[in-house]
């Protein structure tokens, strides 16, 4: 048993069918000897009585908030969380398996540039009584300061007979250095209950690997003349690092026709300006990356060819 | 929102065998653990038995440890109570349970309830 805050306690449970459970002594914050009984939740009923109260935790049925009162005043209260494991592995009950870019991938974490920002989110089929609390470090064994916010629900999506509840976070390293090299990855555990239900949910990750550019800006077209060609113009978003001359992007340039069995024309450049061909009814996209490291594209900016 | 409706009640004779299903609807009924309570007359409502939302692990009161078996068929949005070697004692009202705190026998640890099915078992 270990405390998650003041008064809130977690029970390691490690359960099967006919388990014996975890054997858990609760003490009254009292300096009271004497007369002391004690409850579960709203009951009145009178589970023990004396300074401490030992009880045998093998399911839910037996967490809840324990108070202990003496002549009808309470003198403290100890709300026990169930940490369940099942075949030695902890509950994921609380989060939904994202499934990308791997299995039992329940965190997902994306930046826009190299600042120390990033944003979490995570999924969840639960609307009611779940509060999520984050922390984050880079490195574990001499954690460097990360400070998060707290979590909000961004999105609310139903999907045939599911209904999903979207949350995020968003954090910021203390002492970011943008242009250095990364040696130890950013740590983000979150801490997450439901009812009586507690479970912690971790992902590992370097900046570097979580790149995300928002798209291009300023998407722009110029006919040149006597020619179906057309000069495609856009400048690096606002939120990528500066200076551009040292976090470069490199850039794909798109044209999609009405249909999507349509062939795409693709252009790849480092330039933020390409000459491609409009065709009727088309559309042109581009997207950025970072120009020296593999991570993901952003999605795409378009505009008509018309 | 999750709906729950039991079938399958009815009389029978001490030592037969009977089987309640109960056919669940709304949202994100398969991330619901789901359990089986009764309510004899004049007593409180009793844990039977229950099932992890994965359908993977059980968990039964002791009273019908052995001669009641829990199971869930996600594709069809049902969950079964395989009830054998009836007793008189086993006569109640059984009620369908969806919730998310598996394992639990705590009637109040689960969200959304069925109307129940009768079963008698006579001597």
């Known amino acids: 048993i270990w405390e998650l805050k003041k008064d809130v306690y977690v029970v390691e449970l490690d359960w099967y069918p006919d388990a014996p459970g975890e054997m858990v002594v609760l003490t009254c914050d009292t300096p009271e000897e004497d007369g002391i009984t004690w409850t579960l939740d709203q009951s009145s009923e009178v589970l023990g009585s004396g300074k401490t109260l030992t009880i045998q935790v093998k399911e839910f049925g037996d967490a809840g908030q324990y108070t202990c009162h003496k002549g009808g005043e309470v003198l403290s209260h100890s709300l026990l969380l169930l940490h369940k494991k099942e075949d030695g592995i902890w509950s994921t009950d609380i989060l939904k398996d994202q499934k990308e870019p791997k299995n039992k991938t329940f965190l997902r974490c994306e930046a826009k540039n190299y600042s120390g920002r990033f944003t979490c989110w995570w999924l969840t089929t639960i609307s009611t009584d779940l509060t999520f609390s984050v922390k984050s470090s880079r490195g574990s064994s001499d954690p460097q300061g990360v400070t998060c916010g707290a979590a909000t629900l961004s999105a609310e999506r139903v999907r045939g007979d599911n209904k999903e509840y979207e949350y995020s976070v968003e954090c910021q390293e203390d002492s970011a250095c943008p242009a250095a090299e990364e040696s130890l990855p950013i740590e983000v555990m979150v801490d997450a209950v439901h009812k009586l239900k507690y479970e912690n949910y971790t992902s590992s990750f370097f900046i570097r690997d979580i790149i995300k550019p928002d798209p291009p800006k300023n998407l722009q077209l110029k006919p040149l003349k006597n020619s179906r060609q057309v000069e495609v113009s856009w400048e690096y978003p606002d939120t990528w690092s500066t200076p551009h001359s040292y976090f470069s992007l490199t850039f794909c340039v798109q044209v999609q026709g009405k249909s999507k069995r349509e062939k795409k024309d693709r252009v790849f450049t480092d330039k933020t300006s390409a000459t491609v061909i409009c065709r009727k009814n088309a559309s042109i996209s581009v997207r950025a990356q970072d120009r020296y490291y593999s991570s993901s594209w952003s999605e795409w900016a378009s505009v008509p060819c018309s | 929102e999750v709906q729950l409706v039991e079938s399958g009640g009815g009389v029978v004779q001490a030592g037969e065998s009977l089987r309640l299903s109960c056919a669940a609807s709304?949202?994100?009924?398969?991330?619901?653990?789901l359990g089986w309570f009764r309510q004899a007359p004049g007593m409180e409502r009793e844990f039977v038995a229950a099932?992890?939302?994965?359908?993977?692990?059980?968990y039964y009161a002791d009273s019908v440890k052995g001669r009641f078996t829990i199971s869930r068929d996600n594709a069809k949005n049902t969950v079964y109570l395989q009830m054998s070697s009836l007793k008189p004692e086993d006569t109640a009202v059984y009620y369908c349970a969806a919730g998310r705190l598996y394992p639990s026998s705590r009637s109040r640890d689960y969200d959304y309830w069925g109307q129940g099915t009768q079963v008698t078992v006579s001597s």
């Open positions: 099932i992890s939302w994965r359908g993977s692990s059980t």
């Open positions: 709304g949202y994100n009924f398969k991330d619901h653990d």
